[in-house]
């Protein structure tokens, strides 16, 4: 009976995710039979979030919204170890905008989903950000400096990442 | 080649206002803010403040503020300044200056002398 | 605001020599620092930017350096043409500031 009234409020869990998410991949996390996480597929996952490439070419805000109508928002880097594993899916010829961006120009960088902006946890290439007039972030790759971040222009299109919190059942 | 064309010298007077042009050339003028910069006579550069020419807004020197007004008009890719309750210290070159890559004002405009007299 | 010191205001040299300029910045700039040749007709150009790198057309007699608070401007093998007053500027922080300027005459 346990078992059925939790298999019950999963299936009605998934179902809210279903408009946006058909497919879930699932695993269980630890022994507890009664934990799963979920991202959807074919997003990657990382610690307690997922991950997904936008591939079409947007600016910042048809980006954001993009990511939005998934459940997730541009992607927000806490850490390097987080950044090392985004990096692993991009592709080096290519620039993926993030979640930060600088509204007023007045290099007041801040992250989407309000997280505070720390000075000491960026990845800017040597010399960025160095625009008042670029006031959106990307991440791309330097062949003097690998993966790093680059202030650029709002409305020039790019390709993105979203990230979202994983979806526990 | 890039080019920034000032309107011409102006006298006013005390309490009055004065609205300044900076027409830009050679360039996409909303690709880059439009700075300006005041010089009094033997005196050094002082930063005024700067406008987005692609989003409109503006940031400026807290000393600047509630004298001078920035806004651009895209369609004749000019920028204008207009300082309002001009007193004799006001008195200065007005320059315009594009914004560039590294915190920089890379192109600048000849300069407008604006003199404040009764 | 960050306050930036030319500490010479005017400087006197020969055609021919190597001329150095300094700022000094009262907090550190982190290499945002940009160097303007202002003419006596007062055209402003700008030289150098982000503290050593050379602006489109400037000639290679002029040179950029520092770190920090502390940055110079050199001119080796002064021309006549290099009579001017010469700025610095720092972009790390709004309100930019220039320094107070260094008039640089001919002997």
């Known amino acids: 009976n346990f078992m059925y009234s939790k298999t019950v409020k999963r299936l009605s869990k998934l179902r809210e995710y279903q408009q946006y998410h058909p497919s879930l991949t699932c695993v269980m996390e630890g022994k507890d039979i009664e934990d799963w996480s979920c991202c959807p597929t074919p997003w990657t996952s990382f610690q307690s979030s997922c991950y997904f490439i936008s591939t079409g070419m947007q600016s910042w805000t048809k980006s954001q919204k993009n990511c939005s109508v998934m459940g997730a928002d541009l992607v927000v880097i806490n850490t390097r170890e987080e950044q090392d594993f985004i990096i692993q899916n991009l592709k080096r010829n290519s620039s993926y905008f993030l979640g930060l961006s600088d509204p007023g120009g007045r290099r007041h960088w801040q992250w989407v989903d309000q997280t505070p902006y720390n000075e000491n946890v960026t990845f800017w290439h040597s010399g960025e950000p160095n625009n008042l007039d670029e006031r959106c972030a990307i991440i791309n790759f330097r062949s003097s400096e690998e993966w790093g971040w680059n202030d650029i222009h709002c409305h020039v299109p790019q390709k993105s990442i979203c990230k979202m919190k994983k979806i526990y059942i | 080649q890039v080019q920034l064309q000032q309107s011409g010298a102006e006298v006013v007077k005390p309490g009055a206002s004065v609205k300044i042009s900076c027409k830009g050339s050679?360039?996409?003028?909303?690709?880059?803010?439009m700075h300006w910069v005041r010089q009094a006579h033997a005196k050094s550069l002082e930063w005024i403040g700067v406008?987005?020419?692609?989003?409109?807004?503006?940031n400026y020197n807290q000393k600047f503020k509630g004298k001078v007004t920035m806004t651009v008009d895209t369609s004749s890719s000019t920028a204008y300044m207009e300082l309002s309750r001009l007193r004799s210290d006001d008195t200065a070159v007005y320059y315009c200056?594009?914004?560039?890559?590294?915190?920089?004002?890379?192109?600048w405009g000849q300069g407008t002398l604006v003199t404040v007299s009764s | 605001d960050i306050q930036m010191t030319q500490s010479t205001s005017s400087l006197s040299a020969s055609l021919g020599d190597r001329v150095t300029i300094t700022c000094q910045a009262s907090?550190?700039?982190?290499?945002?620092l940009n160097w303007y040749q202002q003419k006596p007709d007062g055209t402003v150009k700008l030289l150098i930017y982000?503290?050593?790198r050379l602006h489109t057309g400037v000639p290679s007699r002029f040179s950029g350096s520092g770190s920090g608070t502390d940055y110079s401007l050199t001119i080796s093998n002064l021309d006549q043409e290099d009579i001017a007053t010469y700025y610095c500027q720092q972009g790390n922080t709004l309100p930019w500031t220039f320094g107070g300027g260094t008039k640089l005459e001919i002997k």
């Open positions: 200056a594009r914004n560039g890559n590294f915190y920089v004002m890379d192109y």
């Open positions: 050679g360039y996409t003028f909303t690709d880059y803010s």
């Open positions: 907090q550190d700039i982190s290499n945002y």
């Open positions: 406008i987005s020419t692609y989003y409109g807004d503006s």
């Open positions: 982000y503290t050593s």
